[in-house]
């Protein structure tokens, strides 16, 4: 039975040209995390595998950095980066947990972080 929950940074906003950290955290389970995928809509941005380490998609290499931790840093943000991002935790023995983050990239300097929320 899957008892864990994913806590994410929720709805966040950032300025064009700036950077943002996407973070998820798996709690309420003793399952072992074997891999974390970061996806934007249907595009795979990066994978952190417990055995093999990080692999960043070459398409995003110049604008995506691994970490901190299992998170992902997006740099040189553009308005086109606005949208949904997913952290997908592969675990043993539980299976797969998915968290969602919505990022809005703003032209102005009024970007503020949204509240944190949980996805069961």
């Amino acid at each position: 039975m899957m008892t864990g929950t994913i806590e994410t940074t929720g709805n966040i906003s950032a300025e064009k040209g700036g950077s943002i950290i996407l973070q998820c955290h798996l709690s309420s389970t003793t399952a072992q995390v074997t891999q974390v995928n970061w996806e934007q809509q249907d595009q795979l941005l990066a994978i952190c595998n417990a055995d093999l380490g990080w692999h960043i998609s070459p398409s995003f290499k110049d604008r995506v950095a691994p970490g901190p931790g299992l998170g992902l840093t997006l740099q040189s943000l553009t308005v086109n980066d606005t949208g949904e991002y997913f952290c997908i935790y592969h675990t043993y023995p539980d299976g797969t947990y998915t968290g969602r983050i919505f990022l809005e990239v703003l032209e102005s300097s009024v970007a503020e972080h949204g509240a944190r929320f949980q996805i069961p």
Epitope: Q35, I47, N49, L52, G53, P58, K61
Partner: antibody
Framework: EVQLQESGPGLVKPSETLSLTCAAS?????????WHWIRQPPGKKLEWMGF???????VYNPSLKGRITISHDTSKNQFSLKLSSVTAADTAVYFC??????????WGQGTTVTVSS | DIQMTQSPSSLSASVGDRVTITCRTS??????LAWYQQKPGKVPKLLIH???TLAEGVPSRFSGSGSGTDFTLTISSLQPEDVATYYC?????????FGQGTKLEIK
């Protein structure tokens, strides 16, 4: 078009070190992807040996740990394999390959290495 | 290590036949499975990754399915140029491992 070409001695004596190089053309080895070595003993299945990232960090097959070293020379756009203390069991066709999320989308032509005295 | 077991080890089929090769893994690899085709004396060629995503330039008669521990490569209508050995490979952990291969021949 990305191309990979292996080179190195075809014959190595037992207990010596096998050294191979893979030259990449059509793509910079520092521009993403991982760069792998895979081998295939005569009539047997493929065996993954290890890889080097564009950053220079490495990951090896635990079965070869202590014997294997993978390095790269970014100025020549090539990466290399060294395998020490070889035995007849290391006789194989050695392939270099480009890795994307740990599957292999581009392969070299392969080079045969025989371990014999 | 994750063990990869392919079946059958060899098979013979006629042109136009539907051919199925299976790969079973010793533990859950989710969808992280690739298939390669190696023609006699040639280099392995990527056919499919992530269980079902066709590599660039691969004919649509090839397809993949499965998840967890059981996976299938299907050739919907066998062609003479499909004579080869087919290997599965997981891309999920260290060490990356391959199946022992399935040798496909034409009747």
């Amino acid at each position: 078009e990305v191309q990979l070409q292996e080179s190195g001695p075809g014959l190595v004596k037992p207990s010596e070190t096998l050294s191979l190089t893979c030259a990449a053309s059509g793509y910079s080895i520092t521009s993403g992807y991982d760069w792998h070595w895979i081998r295939q003993p005569p009539g047997k299945k493929l065996e993954w040996m290890g890889f080097i990232r564009d950053s220079g960090s490495t990951v090896y097959n635990p079965s070869l740990k202590g014997r294997i070293t993978i390095s790269h020379d970014t100025s020549k756009n090539q990466f290399s394999l060294k395998l020490s203390s070889v035995t007849a069991a290391d006789t194989a066709v050695y392939f270099c390959a480009r890795g994307l999320f740990w599957y292999f989308d581009v392969w070299g032509q392969g080079t045969t290495v025989t371990v014999s005295s | 290590d994750i063990q990869m077991t392919q079946s059958p080890s060899s098979l013979s089929a006629s042109v136009g036949d539907r051919v199925t090769i299976t790969c079973r893994t010793s533990e859950n690899i989710f969808s992280y499975l690739a298939w390669y085709q190696q023609k006699p004396g040639k280099v392995p060629k990527l056919l499919i990754h992530n269980t079902k995503t066709l590599a660039e330039g691969v004919p649509s008669r090839f397809s993949g399915s499965g998840s967890g521990t059981d996976f299938t490569l299907t050739i919907s209508s066998l062609q003479p140029e499909d004579v080869a050995t087919y290997y599965c490979q997981h891309h999920y952990g260290n060490p990356l491992t391959f199946g022992q291969g399935t040798k496909l021949e034409i009747k």
